[in-house]
């Protein structure tokens, strides 16, 4: 296999040499078969190669590793453990690699791993200890700062009996390992709800992306602990209204920007507090674009243009007056 070039261009390994190389100890900084390597950029790209496992002979210098568009299926414990360890690996992208199982300790022995992208993998089985590495009640802190888990929901027929939200949250909270996490992306996962304890245990979060899910309500979610949250993406959900408690919490976060586009806002009497808040707040990005979806008579009305007289609820008739 050809040695890595020290120029910024990528050197490729000849695939037909792979079997010969794997029969002997790997050379210190060789480039794995089917990959492209740049020592100058500290980057290895093994992209769209239908790899079924993580190459064993990754160069020790690798800082950015792209393993996207493969067919990895399972990420076992210690999938990146090497001797000597991949001490420089800071960014790992495994998106779109047909992973359906990530086992406990899959990312162990990566002391510098700051950024992990598992997006676009149908993760039917994400171990609770995938990120913490152990089942201790308090694990060693993970170095992860950015965790990208967009569109990791498997097809419905491949989901296990437990709730998908619960499986993901268990992995996020195990051993309190992700206390230093600053960016968490969970877009496009069909989340119906956000378990109430998840945010309280991720105090360092600066960016939280929950866009394109199916969240109907935030009533039981508390953002109070996310003291330095900067962006909260809630676009393209099923939110009907934000209640006073949520509004007050968001207003109390001094660095936040909230993104609320494309939700089916219900413009009835329960919307009055939110409309008042929207008129006063600066934290909502593009607030002038928010429109009513229901009731029918209010459809496409701009929330900021509503007043209290517009926001009524149909009186509930006592049972004796209800018609069958």
């Amino acid at each position: 296999s050809s040695p890595t070039s020290s120029a910024s261009s990528f050197s490729s390994s000849a695939p037909f040499l792979a079997s010969a190389v794997s029969a002997q100890p790997p050379l210190p900084d060789q480039c794995p078969a089917l990959c492209e390597c740049s020592e100058a950029a500290r980057t290895v790209k093994c992209v769209n190669r239908n790899l079924t496992e993580v190459p064993t002979d990754l160069p020790a210098y690798v800082r950015n590793l792209f393993l996207t568009g493969n067919q990895l299926a399972v990420l076992p414990a210690g999938a990146f453990a090497r001797r000597p360890p991949l001490a420089e690996l800071a960014a790992l992208n495994l998106s779109g690699s047909r992973l359906d199982e990530v086992r406990a300790g899959a990312f162990e022995h990566l002391p510098s791993l700051r950024q992990l992208d598992l997006s676009h993998n149908p993760l039917a089985d994400l171990s609770p200890f995938a990120f913490s590495g152990s089942n201790a009640s308090v694990s060693a802190p993970s170095p992860l700062v950015e965790l990208i888990l967009n569109h990791i929901v498997p097809p419905e027929d491949e989901r296990q009996n437990r709730s998908f939200e619960g499986m993901v949250v268990a992995a996020l909270l195990a051993g309190r390992a992700l206390q230093g996490l600053r960016r968490l992306e969970l877009a496009s996962n069909h989340f119906l709800y956000l378990p109430r304890d998840v945010l309280a245990q991720l105090p360092s979060l600066r960016h939280l992306d929950l866009s394109n899910n199916s969240l109907v309500s935030l009533t039981y979610v508390s953002f109070r602990n996310l003291t330095h949250l900067e962006s909260l993406h809630l676009e393209d959900n099923a939110l009907k209204v934000l209640h006073n408690g949520t509004l007050a919490e968001l207003q109390g976060l001094p660095h936040i920007r909230v993104f609320l586009d494309n939700n089916p806002w219900v413009c009835d009497c329960h919307m009055a507090d939110m409309v008042t808040w929207l008129k006063e707040t600066e934290v909502v990005q593009g607030k002038d674009r928010l429109t009513c979806a229901y009731p029918e008579k209010m459809r496409n009305r701009v929330l900021l243009e509503l007043n209290s007289a517009d926001l009524d609820c149909d009186p509930i008739l006592p049972p004796s007056l209800q018609t069958s």
Epitope: V145, E146, P254, R257
Partner: antibody
Framework: EVQLVQSGAEVKKPGATVKISCKAS????????MNWVKQAPGKGLEWIGR????????NYNGKFKGRATITADTSTTTAYMELSSLRSEDSAVYFC????????WGQGTLVTVSS | DIQMTQSPSSLSASVGDRVTISCRAS??????LNWYQQKPGKAVKLLIY???RLHSGVPSRFSGSGSGTDFTFTISSLQPEDIATYFC?????????FGGGTKLEIK
């Protein structure tokens, strides 16, 4: 770690306008907020304003509103602070600082206003 | 605007000493209180945010406490490299405001 590199020192006449730049590089996890802070010679720190780089939303200290304009170019990860109608009391070092809690600071740009 | 009053304005201490600086806000700022270090000709550094959270890479001899309007910054054992000016700053209510600074010198 985030590196913030600011443009060089400027000498301006009263009434003129100065535009300082601040380029962010290095760490991938920099904040969306970029703040600007003034430090007059021998004095303390004074917050001018900030910009949320992704959508251009700004907040200003009322003392500078109308004279300070903060902008950002996301394609080059560069923020700018323009100060108009300069007067002698604007002579100071101006810092950019990245983060809600101003986690990382630039080296400062000295602006001297003198006729 | 919220006024931040820092004391003392200057302070002389010996290597190994425990040093404390106070900061008082003119109104409640919850825990949104940060501490910065400025050395001549160097970039300003964030040491502590949200009253007591240590910024990454900051030595554990630095700590902070308080809540509401009264806050304290402590260096448990002064080191020669700690000679600098220290500022408190509130980021609870716009506009953000700084204390006047405390210049720390070695005896």
């Amino acid at each position: 770690e985030v590196q913030l590199v600011q443009s060089g020192a400027e000498v301006k006449k009263p009434g003129a306008t100065v535009k300082i730049s601040c380029k962010a590089s290095g760490y991938a996890f920099s904040s969306s907020w970029m703040n600007w802070v003034k430090q007059a010679p021998g004095k303390g720190l004074e917050w001018i304003g900030r910009i949320y780089r992704e959508d251009g939303h700004t907040n200003y200290n009322g003392k500078f509103k109308g004279r300070a304009t903060i902008t950002a170019d996301t394609s080059t990860t560069t923020a700018y602070m323009e100060l108009s109608s300069l007067r002698s009391e604007d002579s100071a070092v101006y810092f950019c600082a990245n983060g809600g809690a101003m986690d990382y600071w630039g080296q400062g740009t000295l602006v001297t206003v003198s006729s | 605007d919220i006024q931040m009053t820092q004391s003392p304005s200057s302070l002389s201490a010996s290597v190994g000493d425990r040093v404390t600086i106070s900061c008082r806000a003119s109104q409640d700022i919850s825990n949104y209180l940060n501490w910065y270090q400025q050395k001549p000709g160097k970039a300003v550094k964030l040491l502590i945010y949200y009253t007591s959270r240590l910024h990454s890479g900051v030595p554990s001899r630095f700590s902070g406490s308080g809540s509401g309007t009264d806050f304290t910054f402590t260096i448990s054992s002064l080191q020669p490299e700690d000679i600098a000016t220290y500022f408190c700053q509130q980021d609870n209510t716009l506009p953000w405001t700084f204390g006047g600074g405390t210049k720390l010198e070695i005896k």
